[in-house]
């Protein structure tokens, strides 16, 4: 695999992650955080190694920023578990809250 295809996957993966985070903000639905974390990572990882790499870099950066701003350790662990769940190819719908609109 070429460096350029890895880069392309990373770019698409970053876009998947961005879309999941922006959907999460738009939905503003109690109990949906883990679903969106899993979905973003799942979609990115499906792109290939570059996508999985981008997902990991973005989630790590996000965790560090949240930690800096005092995000709870328990919430952080739950988010990490959901990130890893999606990145490993498991169905994000496992975390889907009842009634979350289908557009998400």
């Amino acid at each position: 695999r070429s460096f350029f295809s890895f880069l392309g996957e990373a770019f698409d993966g970053a876009r998947d992650m961005w879309r999941a985070y922006s959907d999460m903000r738009e939905a503003n639905y109690i109990g949906s955080d883990k679903y969106f974390h899993a979905r973003g990572n799942y979609d990115a990882a499906k792109r290939g190694p570059g996508g999985a790499w981008a997902a990991e870099v973005i989630t790590d950066a996000r965790e560090n920023i949240q930690r800096f701003f005092g995000h709870g350790a328990e919430d952080s662990l739950a988010d990490q578990a959901a990130n890893e769940w999606g990145r490993s190819g498991k169905d994000p719908n496992h975390f889907r809250p009842a009634g979350l609109p289908e557009k998400y």
């Epitope: 109690i30 496992h94 889907r96 009634g99």
Partner: antibody
Framework: QVQLQQSGAELVRPGVSVKISCKGS????????MHWVKQSHAKSLEWIGV????????SYNQKFKGKATMTEDKSSSTVYMELARLTSEDSAIYYC??????????????WGQGTLVTVSA | DIQMTQSPASLSASVGETVTITCRAS??????LAWYQQKQGKSPQLLVY???TLAEGVPSRFSGSGSGTQFSLKINSLQPEDFGSYYC?????????FGTGTKLELK
């Protein structure tokens, strides 16, 4: 203790609609999703869908979209399911079951006693 | 949709015997499986969730095992109250689906 009390049996004509209810007690109603399950001789147990008791939004099994509509009334801790355009295929026992959380994916530790719906001309 | 297939469809056994019911998922559901018992004219009752966690109040003669696509429910030393129907159900993705059922009858 947790209890789910369902409405009584219904005998209805083909083509009409029926609305059945399930009242939850003994727990915080909006903390758990409520699911509906159909049991018929032909198909054993089938998951119809689930309602988010906090928001009142429902998620349905594709197979039951257009057939079932779920609603809730927080003030009475009651969920409802309306079944439309009934046919003999809809004759079954319908159970409400409390989810293990607000997620769709769930096991069911608490079930209502079931509501028998019979569709007959 | 994930298909859940149980075997056998029915079995006869005597009090005191040990029986095993199996459930096969059409795709990997990891350990997200529940088992229920249902007696004639009654609602199903949860026995096991997460493949092997016994629900509250369930006797220890019941045990669940398996992961991935193959699961089983074992009942040691059958008691008269254990006869009835048994169903498995996955709680992994959507839609949730139940097994075809196993009827356990007294020999």
């Amino acid at each position: 203790q947790v209890q789910l009390q369902q409405s009584g049996a219904e005998l209805v004509r083909p083509g009409v609609s029926v609305k059945i209810s399930c009242k939850g007690s003994g727990y915080t109603f909006t903390d758990y999703a409520m699911h509906w399950v159909k049991q018929s001789h032909a198909k054993s147990l089938e998951w119809i869908g689930v309602i988010n008791t906090y928001y009142g939004d429902a998620s349905y099994n594709q197979k039951f979209k257009g057939k079932a509509t779920m609603t809730e009334d927080k003030s009475s801790s009651t969920v409802y399911m309306e079944l439309a355009r009934l046919t003999s295929e809809d004759s079954a026992i319908y159970y409400c079951a409390r989810g293990s959380s607000i997620m769709i994916t769930s096991w069911f530790a608490y079930w209502g006693q079931g509501t028998l719906v019979t569709v007959s001309a | 949709d994930i298909q859940m297939t149980q075997s056998p469809a029915s079995l006869s056994a005597s009090v005191g015997e040990t029986v095993t019911i199996t459930c096969r998922a059409s795709e990997n559901i990891y350990s997200y499986l529940a088992w229920y018992q249902q007696k004639q004219g009654k609602s199903p009752q949860l026995l096991v969730y997460n493949a092997k966690t016994l629900a509250e109040g369930v006797p220890s003669r019941f045990s669940g095992s398996g992961s991935g696509t193959q699961f089983s429910l074992k009942i040691n030393s059958l008691q008269p109250e254990d006869f009835g129907s048994y169903y498995c159900q996955h709680h992994y993705g959507t839609p949730l689906t139940f097994g075809t059922g196993t009827k356990l009858e007294l020999k």
